[in-house]
């Protein structure tokens, strides 16, 4: 009955809920998901009962141990898992709780440009990086390449100030979640600012 274990999985992947016990005579092991029974095991009886038939193909026990492997993960597998080990040799069941977070593999992030101004030969704008499907727990960073020192910027919004005549710069957004990362298409400062080059005081979206 240890502390809650946090586990992370990816959609379509698999996760193993680690479980060990040194109890000799285990009468039954009961796994539940958000209070719904998932699997009941009777090691001595040799029976494993998966409550919902659709989960049968997703449940496995690596190396014939007590740990439960759940495969073909879906987003809605995220939640609280609980296991109880019942034995006549234990005064009360041995328990363990797990929290599973299932994340999607990130698609290519989308970049949008904010209001752009071009004053005194300097192009000023914001680039905003976002995921089209609103994926959770995404962390954004920007890479700015091309000047003497490559720079990084944390957050989804990158403020840009680029002077005409300077060497061109490339901006790439990196989106990360606990199971994957993906990159936006590279954006060139010169191309970005070309639209406002004719009118030094113009603003555009």
């Amino acid at each position: 009955s240890g502390p809650v274990k946090e586990l992370v999985g990816s959609v379509g992947g698999a996760v193993t809920f680690p479980l060990k016990s040194k109890v000799k005579q285990v009468d039954s092991i009961v796994w539940t998901f958000n209070t719904t029974p998932l699997v009941t095991i009777q090691p001595e009886g040799g029976t494993i009962i998966v409550t919902q038939n659709r989960n049968r193909e997703r449940v496995d026990f690596p190396d014939g141990g007590y740990s439960l492997k759940l495969s073909k993960l879906k987003k809605n597998d995220s939640g609280i898992y609980y296991v109880g080990i019942y034995s006549s040799s234990l005064q009360q069941p041995s328990t363990q709780e797990y929290v599973l977070h299932v994340y999607e593999h990130l698609s290519k992030p989308k970049v949008t440009m904010g209001l752009q101004s071009n004053k005194n030969g300097t192009c000023v704008t914001n680039l905003t990086c976002c995921m089209e499907h609103g994926e959770e727990d995404v962390i954004y960073t920007w890479k700015a390449l091309g000047q003497a020192a490559n720079e990084s910027h944390n957050g989804s919004i990158l403020p840009i100030s680029w002077r005409w005549g300077e060497s061109d710069m490339t901006f790439i957004c990196v989106a990360r979640n606990p199971v994957s990362r993906n990159f936006s298409s590279p954006i060139l400062a010169r191309k970005l600012c070309e639209g406002a080059a004719d009118d030094p005081d113009s603003s555009m979206v």
Epitope: G46, T47, D63, G64
Partner: antibody, heavy 120, light 108 residues
């Protein structure tokens, strides 16, 4: 990795006894049942019994009560099976095999086998 | 003791064939049946436990099914390394555990 290494082949006379050893490594020896299974030449498999090394608890196939005695030494992670009053029909390959945790009657790791030949 | 009757005792098949071996228990053993593969001079190898659970590392062409008294091991597409003898075993509740007589799968 899990390994079960058994002692070498034995040739015994009828009425004698023999003790076969099975040294385990790669897992917690005291926490898994150890089974013994025999296979007479050209025949099928026959379960003899099992021992829980943690406390020495044993369960036998009724057919082998009085014939086989199972013991275990936790300090050396070794299980033993002693066969007494040997007869020619005890000629067989004897295997030790570890029980899985999830289904204690299923056996996932096996020793290489020890041939016991009983002949006058 | 629970008897396990396995059939056929031998069969001839070709690489790529679908092979089915059956095992009948003399009384209800729920889903407590294991299947093993044994090659000459070697120890048995666990394929399936609790009727349908493939042991770690066992190829997906091996499938176990059944409950109660009737059980089946299916090899979906026989490979050269699958020619061996197969045993079913009931591991229900209190021992003794008992094995079927074996099925020898030979090359046609």
């Amino acid at each position: 990795q899990v390994q079960l290494v058994q002692s070498g082949a034995e040739v015994k006379k009828p009425g004698a006894s023999v003790k076969v050893s099975c040294k385990a490594s790669g897992y917690t020896f005291s926490s898994s049942w150890m089974n013994w299974v025999r296979q007479a030449p050209g025949q099928g498999l026959e379960w003899i019994g099992r021992i829980y090394p943690g406390d020495g608890d044993t369960k036998y196939n009724g057919k082998f009560k009085g014939k086989a005695t199972l013991t275990a030494d936790k300090s050396t992670s070794t299980a033993y099976m002693e066969l007494s009053s040997l007869r020619s029909e005890d000629t067989a390959v004897y295997y030790c095999a570890r029980s899985t945790m999830i289904a204690t009657g299923a056996m996932d790791y096996w020793g290489q086998g020890t041939l016991v030949t009983v002949s006058s | 003791d629970i008897q396990m009757t396995q059939s056929p005792s031998s069969l001839s098949a070709s690489v790529g064939d679908r092979v089915t071996i059956t095992c009948k228990a003399s009384q209800d053993v729920s889903t407590a049946v294991a299947w093993y593969q044994q090659k000459p001079g070697k120890a048995p190898k666990l394929l399936i436990y609790s009727a349908s659970y493939r042991y770690t590392g066992v190829p997906s062409r091996f499938t176990g099914s059944g409950s109660g008294t009737d059980f089946t091991l299916t090899i979906s597409s026989l490979q050269p390394e699958d020619f061996a003898t197969y045993y079913c075993q009931q591991h229900y509740s209190t021992p003794p555990y008992t094995f079927g007589g074996g099925t020898k799968v030979e090359i046609k």
